[in-house]
Amino acid sequence: SERCDDWGLDTMRQIQVFEDEPARIKCPLFEHFLKFNYSTAHSAGLTLIWYWTRQDRDLEEPINFRLPENRISKEKDVLWFRPTLLNDTGNYTCMLRNTTYCSKVAFPLEVVQKDSCFNSPMKLPVHKLYIEYGIQRITCPNVDGYFPSSVKPTITWYMGCYKIQNFNNVIPEGMNLSFLIALISNNGNYTCVVTYPENGRTFHLTRTLTVKVVGSPKNAVPPVIHSPNDHVVYEKEPGEELLIPCTVYFSFLMDSRNEVWWTIDGKKPDDITIDVTINESISHSRTEDETRTQILSIKKVTSEDLKRSYVCHARSAKGEVAKAAKVKQKVPAPRYTVELACGFGAT
C-alpha cells in the first residue's frame, strides 16, 4: 500500500468508558491533527476507515460492523458502541484516505468495569467548588449526542453510593447538581446516571466526578511570609551551618502559579559562587491553601556570607512579597581567664 501519514498512537487521548454502556468516540484526526473537518473530507471524496488491535495482540483487524443489534456502528466521524463489552479494550485506528491521500491515527480505548457503588479504576475529573461562595453547579459531563432532544432521559445523582435525596445543601436539577453553599463535607465523588430508551432497549450513561471544595476567591490574600520575620535573628559563627527557612502561605487561587525563591545579595543562588543548597517542601490545607517552605542552607558559613543580604520572595496571582532574614555574625564571648588576668596586670 502507498505511504500514509501516520500520527502514531495518540496516548494523550486515553479514552476510558464503562462496560455495558453506550460510547461514542470521535475520530481524533479531525479534532487534533487535520485542519479540515469530516464534512469537508467527505465532500472531497475521502473515506474514513476504522480498524483495531485487540489488547495484548499485534494484529490489526477490521471492526465488525455486522454484530447483532448493530452493537458497533459508524456514523460520520463517530464510532458507536451500543453498548461496550469488556473485550472491546484495545487500540483503535481511524484512517482517512482516497487514491492520492492517506492519514491515520490510533488511540487506546479501555473498557472499565464498575461495581454497584460506581467504584472503578476510571480516572475521575476533578471539579473545584469555592467554599461558602453561594450557589454553584456541576453538570453531568459528556452526555451530548447520545440521544435526540425529543428523548427525555431520567437523571439520578449519587454521592458515593447513595442517591442524593433531600441532602441539606445539594439539589439535583436534571443534568445539573446545585450546591447551595459548598462545605468541606461536600468533598467526594458524585455520579450522575442518565437512563434513556433507544429501539426498545434501556441504556445507562454513568459519569463520576470528584468534587473538591477549595478556598474562595473572596477570602484570597497575597502571599504571607511567616518566616523569615523580625523576631528571629540568625546569629552564627564562621564555620557553623546556616539554615534559614522561608515559609509562605498562599491562599487557594484557581490556576495560580505559586512561587517562592531566595535571593542572596539580590541574585538567585544559582548565580553566585557560594555553596548553597535549597530544599523545598509543600503542604496543603483542606481547602487547598498552600504552605511552601524553602530552607536555604550553607554548610560552613564564612564571615563574608554572614554579611550578605538573604531575601525570601513569594509571588501568586494576588501579588508579590519579599522579606529579608536577619543574619549576623555571633560576637565571640570574652575568653574569661585571659581577660581577667590582663585586668589584674598579670604578665
Epitope: E19, D20, P83, D115, S116, C117, F118, T154, Y158, C161, Y162, K163, Q165, N166, T191, V193, T195, R201, T202, H204
Partner: antibody, heavy 120, light 107 residues
C-alpha cells in the same frame, strides 16, 4: 422501626375508582422513593408505579398508565395510589415498598398489603 | 420493557440440598438485579441486592452471582424455613420488572 401500612382496599365495580394510602413511620419519609407493587391471587409480583422522594418523577407500568396516579404528602408521611377506570384484572393485593437509596434500588421494606377486588 | 425470565418455575428439593435458581434478562442490566423471598400470605423480603450483595440479617447460605443478562440465586444448604417463592427484579430501567417467580417446595 420502619413501618409501612397500606389501607383503602376493598370491593369495587369495574370502571369505578379507589384510592389507596400507605402510611410510613420509623424513617425519614421525604428522603426515599416509594413504589406500589401488586400481586393478583395465586400470581407473581407486578410492579405498578414509583414516585421519587420529592415527587419530581413518577413512572408507571404500561398496564396502569393513564388510569392510576401515584402521589405523596411528605408532611403527612403518606403515599397514595389513585386508581380510576378499574378493571377486573386490577384485582390484587397492593403493597407499598420503600426503595433503598442506592444505585441498584432494592425494596428493603414492604407493607403488609391491602386487597383490592374489582368485581361486578 | 425489560423482560425477566426465571427458571425453573417450580422446584422440589430436600432439607440440606444445594439449589440454584436462574434469572435471565432480555438485555444487559449490568448488576441491577435484586432477589426476594415470599412466603404465603406475607410481603416479599429482600435477600440479595446488586446481584451479589447479601442484605443485612439474611443467612449466609444465600448467595447471588452473575451480571449483564444471566444471574443465579444459590441456597447452599436448604433449611425448612427456605421453602417459599423466590423472585428476581431488575432496577436498571425506570420501569421495574420482576421475574415470574420460582416456587421452592419440599420433596
Amino acid at each position: 422501626q420502619v413501618q409501612l401500612v397500606e389501607s383503602g382496599g376493598g370491593v369495587v365495580q369495574p370502571g369505578r375508582s379507589l384510592r389507596l394510602s400507605c402510611a410510613a413511620s420509623g424513617f425519614t419519609f421525604r428522603n426515599y422513593g416509594i413504589h406500589w407493587v401488586r400481586q393478583a391471587p395465586g400470581k407473581g409480583l407486578e410492579w405498578v408505579a414509583v414516585i421519587w422522594y420529592d415527587g419530581s418523577n413518577k413512572f408507571y407500568a404500561d398496564s396502569v398508565k393513564g388510569r392510576f396516579t401515584i402521589s405523596r404528602d411528605n408532611s403527612k408521611n403518606t403515599l397514595y395510589l389513585q386508581m380510576n377506570s378499574l378493571r377486573v384484572e386490577d384485582t390484587a393485593v397492593y403493597y407499598c415498598a420503600r426503595e433503598e437509596g442506592i444505585a441498584v434500588a432494592p425494596f428493603d421494606y414492604w407493607g403488609q398489603g391491602t386487597l383490592v377486588t374489582v368485581s361486578s | 420493557d425489560i423482560q425477566m425470565t426465571q427458571s425453573p418455575s417450580s422446584l422440589s428439593a430436600s432439607v440440606g440440598d444445594r439449589v440454584a435458581i436462574t434469572c435471565r434478562a432480555n438485555q444487559s442490566i449490568a448488576s441491577y438485579l435484586n432477589w426476594y423471598q415470599q412466603k404465603p400470605g406475607k410481603a416479599p423480603k429482600l435477600l440479595i441486592y446488586g446481584a451479589s450483595s447479601l442484605q443485612n440479617g439474611v443467612p449466609s447460605r444465600f448467595s447471588g452471582s452473575g451480571s449483564r443478562t444471566d444471574f443465579t440465586l444459590t441456597i447452599s444448604s436448604l433449611q425448612p424455613e427456605d421453602f417459599a417463592t423466590y423472585y428476581c427484579q431488575q432496577s436498571y430501567s425506570t420501569e421495574i420488572t420482576f421475574g415470574q417467580g420460582t416456587r421452592l417446595e419440599i420433596k
